[in-house]
């Protein structure tokens, strides 16, 4: 389980830094792209490419920009109002249940099944039974049952749903 964000995980602001613009809080909050000063009197801008805030806030620190992992490509860079957007490289995908890593897509479907959905950065290939059209969510079957397979492809559970 992940630990909560601590102040070490956030990018502290050098309050005297001349490049950081200041403005006054509105109703005790600072706008996207800013955080509030410790005395609550100023809104201090986040540093482009280093940290960000996406909504009105009373944060003492902007949030540190995400760095894309190896195996990911950067779709859009971090700005003061939006975190970096990372996406799995071609041929890999990220499941919602295990968002911490990109996994290799299978290269083919089990025998008796046909591919109806391609590998995307968000999902493995989708296979259905030829006859029934029942979905198969990604079990890698025994080697002799595999139409095409790639070594090192991690197994994931199979759930047949009507």
């Amino acid at each position: 389980e992940s630990a909560l964000i601590t102040q070490q995980d956030l990018a502290p602001q050098q309050r005297a830094a001349p490049q950081q613009k200041r403005s006054s809080p509105s109703e005790g909050l600072c706008p996207p792209g800013h955080h509030i000063s410790e005395d609550g009197r100023d809104c201090i801008s986040c540093k482009y490419g280093q940290d960000y805030s996406t909504h009105w806030n009373d944060l003492l620190f902007c949030l540190r920009c995400t760095r894309c992992d190896s195996g990911e490509v950067e779709l859009s860079p971090c700005t003061t109002t939006r975190n970096t957007v990372c996406q799995c490289e071609e041929g890999t995908f990220r499941e919602e249940d295990s968002p911490e890593m990109c996994r290799k897509c299978r290269t083919g479907c089990p025998r008796g099944m046909v591919k109806v959905g391609d590998c995307t950065p968000w999902s493995d290939i989708e296979c259905v039974h030829k006859e029934s059209g029942t979905k198969h969510s990604g079990e890698v079957p025994a080697v002799e049952e595999t139409v095409t397979s790639s070594p090192g492809t991690p197994a994931s559970p199979c759930s047949l749903s009507g």
């Epitope: 909560l4 964000i5 806030n57 944060l59 975190n83």
Partner: nanobody, 125 residues
Framework: EVQLLESGGGEVQPGGSLRLSCAAS????????MGWFRQAPGKEREFVSA????????YYAESVKGRFTISRDDAKSTLYLQMSSLRAEDTAVYYC??????????????????WGQGTLVTVKP
């Protein structure tokens, strides 16, 4: 598994106040990101507010800025939303949300792993 139970909704006049509570059970929420979304009749769910990190600050949608205040009591596994200066456009079902990964606040519905059943807030004269 985390179960969420919201309470505190009801009918209130414009300008009135309500305090919503969200009690979490199943496990401690101290290591979880939490927040509130709402869904007005015929509209999509929208972000309201999020607790960004423990003992830290919070995020608010522009539409509720200065009127709503989010807070949490990890010892009681409870999230709160104090709503004041309520308007007719605040009428909605309010949902408490929790995410297993707290590195970033929950500002989109996709980031939430668990949802409460919702509590209805109606603002009318």
């Amino acid at each position: 598994e985390v179960q969420l139970l919201e309470s505190g909704g009801g009918e209130v006049q414009p300008g009135g106040s309500l305090r919503l509570s969200c009690a979490a059970s199943g496990r401690s929420i101290s290591n979880y990101a939490m927040g509130w979304f709402r869904q007005a009749p015929g509209k999509e769910r929208e972000f309201v507010s999020a607790s960004v990190w423990n003992q830290g600050g919070n995020y608010y949608a522009e539409s509720v800025k200065g009127r709503f205040t989010i807070s949490r009591d990890d010892a009681k596994s409870t999230l709160y939303l104090q709503m004041s200066s309520l308007r007719a456009e605040d009428t909605a079902v309010y949902y408490c949300v929790v995410a297993r990964t707290p590195e970033t606040p929950i500002t989109s519905a996709r980031g939430a792993n668990y949802w409460g059943q919702g509590t209805l807030v109606t603002v009318k004269p």
